[in-house]
């Protein structure tokens, strides 16, 4: 059975989470991808998604979340800028493949954000605003309204075939939550 594993990232407030999700490019290059948060006992909640079909190297920003899908490499890059303590949580990357349930990518990310930015002298990342200037063409993509018939328990699923799907609620104007991404598939 496929075991779902977690990777932990411990970062400070104001820093940027930067993870890459690896997918099979022949199968999923143009598929819509999403970044989700998983809360205990709840359906995964979609925080941001790429366009449909997903555009190559085209940044999509939802709040502090930036998604970039690199078709040639089979990689979805997920960044969450200006992290807040409240962003701490469990995240995952999924690929939408209607009418089937979304395909989850490994691993889940356990994000732990603590108070106090600890940049070092000479660091050019003390101001996230200056580092990540999102192009004016950045779009906000509407995410599919998926609801899984399966219930979500606190125990992670045992195989990708049993992975729960994202829920249907996403507020694009108020997504300042968390970000997290799994990687290689």
């Amino acid at each position: 059975a496929t075991k779902l594993t977690e990777e932990k990232y411990e970062l400070k407030e104001g820093q940027t989470l930067d993870v890459k999700c690896d997918y099979t490019l022949e199968k999923f290059a143009s598929s819509q991808k999403a970044w989700q948060i998983i809360r205990d006992g709840e359906m995964p909640k979609t925080l941001a998604c790429t366009e449909r079909p997903s555009k190559n190297s085209h940044p999509v920003q939802v709040g502090r979340i930036i998604l970039e899908d690199y078709h040639d490499h089979g990689l979805l890059r997920v960044r969450m800028v200006n992290l807040q303590v409240e962003d701490s949580g469990l995240y995952q990357c999924v690929i939408y493949q209607p009418p089937k349930e979304p395909h989850m990518l490994f691993d889940r990310i356990r994000l732990v954000v603590t108070k106090g930015f600890s940049g070092t002298p000479g660091s050019n990342e003390n101001s996230t605003q200056n580092v990540y200037k999102i192009p004016p063409t950045t779009t906000k993509a509407l995410c599919p309204l998926y609801t899984s018939p399966r219930t979500v328990t606190q125990a992670p699923p045992k195989s990708t075939a049993d992975v729960s799907t994202p829920d249907s609620e996403i507020n694009l104007t108020n997504v300042t939550d968390i970000i997290r991404v799994p990687v290689f598939n």
């Epitope: 496929t2 075991k3 594993t5 990777e7 990232y9 411990e10 970062l11 400070k12 820093q15 940027t16 930067d18 993870v19 890459k20 690896d22 997918y23 099979t24 490019l25 022949e26 199968k27 490499h73 089979g74 990689l75 890059r77 490994f106 691993d107 990310i109 050019n124 990342e125 580092v131 991404v181 799994p182 990687v183 290689f184 598939n185």
Partner: antibody, heavy 119, light 108 residues
């Protein structure tokens, strides 16, 4: 427990070929990228090549591009590195390494296999 | 290609003392940095990733910090088993993924 074990190293003449293999266990092999990293005697670490979990994407260092080929067999949980047109500068311990699930760093390493290119 | 520069090349420290190792990237890599430990005749072992996060099983005397271009690995109280060579590695996005040249921590 995650384990990776390399084999196939040895002595080869300049211009010759060698095939390294890596057997992996303890994790869902096809869910993770795998890499080869080498270390010349007394020197530092040098990334050589990476292949995605599905095998659909491969990356190579400029120093080996066109001469080395990385491949994987997900049904057997094995990773290979076919090395052609070998040079003295390719002499090194070659490590098989599992790539992390969220970024391009290496969370588990094999013990390494020594490749010596000499006449 | 991003160039990673480690300093010092060799650090002489007495057991129980604090060791501070530096790693500098030629361009900003956010917190996309890992640290590895390598003992003679052994494979490298992952210590820290994401600049701050300790890998599984790594003692809390090891800590990482920094972002952008300047990074630090601190060993708060050196134990005999900590004398080794330490490498940093960037993983910001595309290959080549580069390592620093290493810092050897030796017994003073």
């Amino acid at each position: 427990e995650v384990q990776v074990l390399e084999s196939g190293g040895g002595l080869v003449q300049p211009g010759g070929s060698l095939r390294l293999s890596c057997a992996a266990s303890g994790f869902t092999f096809n869910a993770y990228a795998m890499s080869w990293v080498r270390q010349a005697p007394g020197k530092g670490l040098e990334w050589v090549s990476t292949i995605s979990g599905s095998g659909s994407t491969t990356y190579y260092a400029d120093s080996v591009k066109g001469r080395f080929t990385i491949s994987r067999d997900n049904s057997k949980n094995t990773l290979d590195l076919q090395m052609n047109s070998l040079r003295a500068a390719d002499t090194a311990v070659y490590y098989c390494a599992k790539v992390a699930g969220s970024n391009f760093f290496f969370d588990h390493w094999g013990q390494g296999t020594l490749v010596t290119v000499s006449s | 290609e991003i160039v990673m520069t480690q300093s010092p090349a060799t650090l002489s420290v007495s057991p129980g003392e604090r060791a501070t190792l530096s790693c500098r990237a030629s361009q900003s890599i956010n917190v996309n940095l890992a640290w590895y430990q390598q003992k003679p005749g052994q494979a490298p072992r992952l210590l820290i990733y994401g600049a701050y996060t300790r890998a599984t099983g790594i003692p809390d005397r090891f800590s990482g910090s920094g972002s952008g271009t300047e990074f630090t690995l601190t060993i708060s109280s050196l134990q005999s088993e900590d004398f080794a060579v330490y490498y940093c590695q960037e993983f910001i996005m595309w290959p080549p993924w580069t390592f620093g040249q290493g810092t050897k921590v030796e017994i003073k």
